[in-house]
């Protein structure tokens, strides 16, 4: 921000009324009036260029310092070219000297040179040559000097002429302030510029109404430079929840809008399924039946639990069931739907029922499923199973009601045995099998059916209570189709896959290959 100038003395604006002191009296400096741009202007002028040893002083009136620490002196003046005088005026000069003196009181007409300290020699950038003078072109020079730190109540300036032809048209003395400033929602007070050029005065800012320093942020500070400019902003204020930045202020969110945190962001429109918010809202309440999960951003619409899975099927495959379902028709407005599968088994004879989570096996963990199918195995034959698939989302935990669909299935067969070839020879095949332990108690025998591949007219059957059998009297180097099936009191269980096993050829009869 531009520095603010506080003027302590302005000769040009005073219209010749200041009455400065000249020394020696009646010689040297003289108050003149001239016409420029059809306006009367006043100037202090001296032009004793033909006489040597000039020492003419012009002293200002006493200037009250006030709060100024460093003053700036702006001079507007014109200096005539020494060559514009006949014979060159050998004693003529083209500079003058600027002095100051501090004091706690006004000495009036008591002028003492020794009290004055030289600030600088003032030289023009442009001198007024003869042609400019004749044409009344005033070559105005502007020079600025500064003095500080000042400590007394007031001061004088003085101008010493040593034989120049000079006119002072303007003497302006001012000090600089960093103006009151609103930046980053912080208000910085008007501050007097310091007196030492390298130093910057640190000034703390105050957050505007309804603005705060963000958590973990720095307090707002700026630095007031010697020239009255604000520099190096540090920290900031942000509008508090329920308020947004409008130009340099924090304004309450309009009805129907909200802002839930201290941030730079504007107020947002209340999302779907929320009630209209009042002015200055930090959040928007959910409509009846709609909810917001703890992790949901406030900008997200309110949502509700999903409806039940749309369609559920249970397809039995021996002692396995594949459960398939479709997503709920109403997701509740959320995408974080998961499914939970629970299982209940009932004994047909007694009608007694109980949970079966511990006795069955799921193809993947049954809670928090994201896919819409799961396979349940290790089911006991001749048992009734009821499967419940519940759809849940991020807000399901906020209500007591559940959204689920059930499917029941009766297991009438054992699971198909898993068959392995344990060994073979040119005339025999050793075969073993297994079924899940929960089903073994219901099996009283296993039936092994085998035949030559390609011979669909005849087959052989062997029954055993064990889990293995050796099939003898087989033809060498021949492929046999083998299937194992469990037999229960209620009938046949599910048959295994049909396996192809080949006997050895006569050349390799010495070894038993597995």
């Amino acid at each position: 921000a531009q520095g603010k100038e506080v003027v302590l003395l302005d000769f040009a604006a005073a219209g010749g009324e200041l009455g400065w002191l000249t020394h020696p009296y009646g010689k040297g400096w003289d108050l003149m009036q001239n016409i420029m741009n059809d306006m009367p202007i006043y100037m202090y002028s001296v032009c004793n260029v033909m006489s040597g040893d000039q020492d003419n002083w012009l002293r200002t009136n006493w200037v009250y310092r006030g709060e100024a620490e460093r003053i700036f002196i702006e001079l507007k003046f014109t200096v005539r070219d020494c060559n514009s005088f006949p014979g060159g005026a050998s004693s003529c000069k083209e500079t003058f000297n600027l002095y100051y003196a501090e004091s706690d009181l006004d000495y009036g007409t008591n002028f003492q040179k020794r009290l004055f300290t030289k600030i600088d020699t003032i030289a023009p950038d442009e001198i007024t040559v003869s042609s400019d003078f004749e044409a009344r072109h005033v070559k105005l020079n502007v020079e600025e000097r500064s003095v500080g730190p000042l400590t007394r109540k007031g001061f004088y300036l003085a101008f010493q002429d040593i034989g120049a032809c000079v006119a002072l048209l303007s003497v302006r003395v001012y000090y600089k302030k960093c103006p009151e400033l609103l930046q980053s929602l912080a208000r910085f007070p008007e501050t007097i510029a310091g007196s030492d050029a390298p130093s910057l005065a640190t000034v703390a800012g105050t957050c505007v109404d309804h603005a705060v320093v963000p958590p973990g942020g720095e307090e707002p500070r700026m630095h007031c430079a010697v020239d009255g400019e604000w520099l190096v902003p540090i920290g900031q204020c942000l509008c508090q929840a329920g308020y947004e930045k409008v130009e340099d202020a924090c304004q309450a969110c309009s009805p129907g809008f909200f802002k839930f945190e201290v941030s730079e962001s504007p107020c947002l429109e209340c999302p779907e399924h929320t009630l209209p918010s009042p002015e200055g809202a930090t959040s928007c309440e959910c409509e009846e039946g709609f909810f917001r999960a703890p992790q949901d951003p406030m900008s997200m619409p309110c949502t509700r639990p999903p409806s039940a899975p749309h369609y559920l099927t249970a397809v039995g495959m021996g002692a396995k069931v594949e459960l398939r379902w479709t997503p709920p028709q109403d997701s509740g407005g959320r995408e974080d739907i998961v499914y939970s599968v629970t299982c209940e088994q009932c004994w047909p004879e007694s009608g007694e029922c109980g949970p079966c989570e511990s006795s069955v096996r799921y193809s993947e963990p049954p809670h928090g499923l994201t896919r819409t199918s799961v396979t349940v195995s290790d089911l006991e034959p001749h048992m009734n199973y009821t499967f419940t698939v519940e759809a849940r989302n991020g807000v399901s935990g906020l209500v007591t009601s559940r959204s689920f669909r059930t499917a029941s299935v009766s297991i009438n067969q054992t699971e198909p045995p898993k068959v392995r070839l344990e060994g073979r020879s040119t005339t025999s095949l050793s075969v073993s099998w297994s079924i899940p332990p929960p089903q073994q108690s219901r099996v009283w025998k296993y039936e092994v059916t085998y035949r030559k591949k390609g011979d669909s007219n005849s087959y052989n059957v062997r029954r055993t209570e064990g889990f293995s059998v050796t099939l003898d009297d087989l033809a060498p180097d021949t492929t046999y189709l083998v299937q194992v099936q469990a037999l229960t009191q209620e009938g046949q269980g599910a048959g295994s896959k049909v396996h192809e096993f080949q006997t050895l050829s006569p050349e390799g009869s010495g070894s038993l290959a597995v």
Partner: antibody
Framework: EVQLLESGGGLVQPGGSLRLSCAAS????????MAWVRQAPGKGLEWVSR????????HYADSVKGRFTISRDNSKNTLYLQMNSLRAEDTAVYYC?????????????????????WGQGTLVTVSS | DIQMTQSPSSLSASVGDRVTITCRAS??????LAWYQQKPGKAPKLLIY???NLHTGVPSRFSGSGSGTEFSLTISGLQPDDFATYYC?????????FGQGTKVEIK
């Protein structure tokens, strides 16, 4: 020594014309502002016109504006006053006068000029 | 235009007298005032410029003072050569008007 010598005066009828000349010597003519000042018989001085060192700007008294023309020829060190539509009240001794800013010991020139050097004058009589 | 009024219009004085002539401007002219001396049948001669500055070659018995609207020319110790008519002239405006003159005669 600065010398200004006017010529061209004489008797002329009302409505007639006359051209006055002023020959300058003893100084750098092209540095000087030049002017014509007249004095009616037994009366005071009246400024008539001025011309800048290099031929401009020119100014005229209201009483002669539009009738008189001031000019100069710096190569000939001569100042002129062309007087047309002459009237009886133009009867006067016409002085040529000069001003050199070098001799004006002020930092800022006055709004107009005063006259440091004068010629001896030439009489113009307008009469029928 | 600015009017310049001189007083008195004439005065009688003796050699050695101190004589003062005044000139009043109809509006402020700061110090932009010149004084001239004219003898019968001769051209005027510059005495003083900028109200108080003595022109080169002018005797120091002549002095000028004043600013704004009131000005004076003083001859301190009148000499026989000083009997003449004196004119003031303002050069604060382009019209450059003269006073009507003050005739200084021998008593």
């Amino acid at each position: 020594e600065v010398q200004l010598l006017e010529s061209g005066g004489g008797l002329v009828q009302p409505g007639g014309s006359l051209r006055l000349s002023c020959a300058a010597s003893g100084f750098t003519f092209s540095h000087y502002m030049m002017a014509w000042v007249r004095q009616a018989p037994g009366k005071g001085l009246e400024w008539v016109s001025r011309i800048g060192p290099s031929g401009g700007p020119t100014h005229y008294a209201d009483s002669v504006k539009g009738r008189f023309t001031i000019s100069r020829d710096n190569s000939k060190n001569t100042l002129y006053l062309q007087m047309n539509s002459l009237r009886a009240e133009d009867t006067a001794v016409y002085y040529c006068a000069g001003y050199d800013s070098g001799y004006d010991y002020v930092a800022v020139a006055g709004p107009a000029e005063y006259f440091q050097h004068w010629g001896q004058g030439t009489l113009v009589t307008v009469s029928s | 235009d600015i009017q310049m009024t001189q007083s008195p219009s004439s005065l009688s004085a003796s050699v050695g007298d101190r004589v003062t002539i005044t000139c009043r401007a109809s509006q402020s002219i700061s110090t932009w005032l010149a004084w001239y001396q004219q003898k019968p049948g001769k051209a005027p001669k510059l005495l003083i410029y900028k109200a108080s500055n003595l022109h080169t070659g002018v005797p120091s018995r002549f002095s000028g003072s004043g600013s704004g609207t009131e000005f004076s020319l003083t001859i301190s110790g009148l000499q026989p050569d000083d009997f003449a008519t004196y004119y003031c002239q303002q050069y604060n405006q382009y019209s450059r008007t003269f006073g009507q003159g003050t005739k200084v005669e021998i008593k």
